[in-house]
């Protein structure tokens, strides 16, 4: 497990890093997990890449960021924000959030403590 203790990364530094990395593979990976082969999610070609490949790409992107809980939280919040409007109902929002919470562990990172994923001003 990657782990850092103490100061958790300057906020502006994290914002810059999250802006720089490509979070699309993470978004696709989670959507594949909750949607499977459902046809209605046609914004991505879900069948073009296996979920395990997307997960690895996602982890590789997250690995480009500074190893802090703060930056990981910011990345998860950004993923939630990016996908919020695509989530069609409350159940889907909860499913997406559950998968998002599992993402750090899947990538062998420490989950960010105190990370509030309800960041979309009530939209999600």
């Amino acid at each position: 497990m990657r782990r850092e203790r103490g100061r958790q990364g300057d906020s502006s530094s994290c914002e810059r890093q999250v802006d720089r990395v490509n979070l699309k593979p993470c978004e696709q990976h989670i959507m594949q997990r909750i949607m499977g082969e459902q046809e209605q999610y046609d914004s991505y070609d879900i069948r073009s890449t296996r979920s395990s490949d997307q997960q690895q790409r996602c982890c590789d992107e997250l690995n480009e960021m500074e190893n802090t809980q703060r930056c990981m939280c910011e990345a998860l919040q950004q993923i939630m924000e990016n996908q919020c409007d695509r989530l069609q109902d409350r159940q889907m929002v909860q499913q997406f959030k559950r998968e998002l919470m599992n993402l750090p562990q899947q990538c062998n990172f420490r989950a960010p403590q105190r990370c509030d994923l309800d960041v979309s001003g009530g939209r999600c």
Partner: antibody, heavy 123, light 110 residues
């Protein structure tokens, strides 16, 4: 019933030391973060320090880091705050609190508080 | 001076509604959960709201919490004279690795 009882406060000269204790009962102490919070006379609340369930992680207010040490004894359901190099600005009521912080996607919150113990730093 | 900004005082008549704001930044309220506390004169504080919107058992639904961006709000409806107290918000600050409290708001029920 959850109970937190602080002790160890008193009058101490600047530069002196005190050790606060908090005896907890009514819940499984070893499964909760614990926190010290203080309140100077007539002022607001100020967080002092957190300690994780197993004592492996501690966080401190900048102005007390290096002078104060938070610790716990899960076998005795007790929380401690060792305060060294005390200053006049450390004068306050010190509260022992149970912190509800649990998993990664929850926050710090203080759902049970002791009655507080007064620490006065004065010459 | 507190990093979390609250109005020093608010007032309203019995039965009315009041809101207390708590303003922070992206490194604290913007990314972390907010809790609210009531401190009656001469007593220890009591938890009213945790994780932005949740109420502990025993806290009436007259008390509510919300959060948007880097600000949080405590709402109290059906004001009672017994609600006269100091109210504090709190959250974690990821940059400071510390819990922050607001400066407190004194509620007066007219």
């Amino acid at each position: 019933e959850v109970q937190l009882v602080e002790s160890g406060g008193g009058l101490v000269q600047p530069g002196g030391s005190l050790r606060l204790s908090c005896a907890a009962s009514g819940f499984k102490f070893s499964t909760f973060y614990m926190t010290w919070i203080r309140q100077a006379p007539g002022k607001g609340l100020e967080w002092v320090a957190n300690i994780k369930q197993d004592g492996s992680e501690k966080d401190y207010l900048d102005s007390v880091r290096g002078r104060f040490t938070i610790s716990r004894d899960n076998a005795k359901s007790s929380l401690y705050l060792q305060m060294n190099s005390l200053r006049a600005e450390d004068t306050a009521v010190y509260y022992c609190t149970r912190n509800g912080l649990q998993d990664s996607y929850s926050g710090d919150f203080f759902d049970h508080w002791g009655q507080g113990t007064l620490v006065t730093v004065s010459s | 001076q507190s990093v979390l900004t609250q109005p020093p005082s608010v007032s309203a008549a019995p039965g009315q509604k009041v809101t207390i704001s708590c303003s922070g930044t992206g490194s604290n309220i913007g990314h972390n959960y907010v809790s609210w506390y009531q401190q009656l004169p001469g007593t220890a504080p009591k938890l009213l709201i945790f994780d932005n919107t949740k109420r502990p058992s025993g806290i009436p639904d007259r008390f509510s919490g919300s959060k948007s961006g880097s600000s949080a709000t405590l709402g109290i409806t059906g004001l009672q004279t017994g609600d006269e107290a100091d109210y504090f918000c709190a959250t974690w600050d990821a940059d400071l690795s510390a819990v922050l409290f607001g400066g407190g708001t004194k509620l007066t029920v007219l």
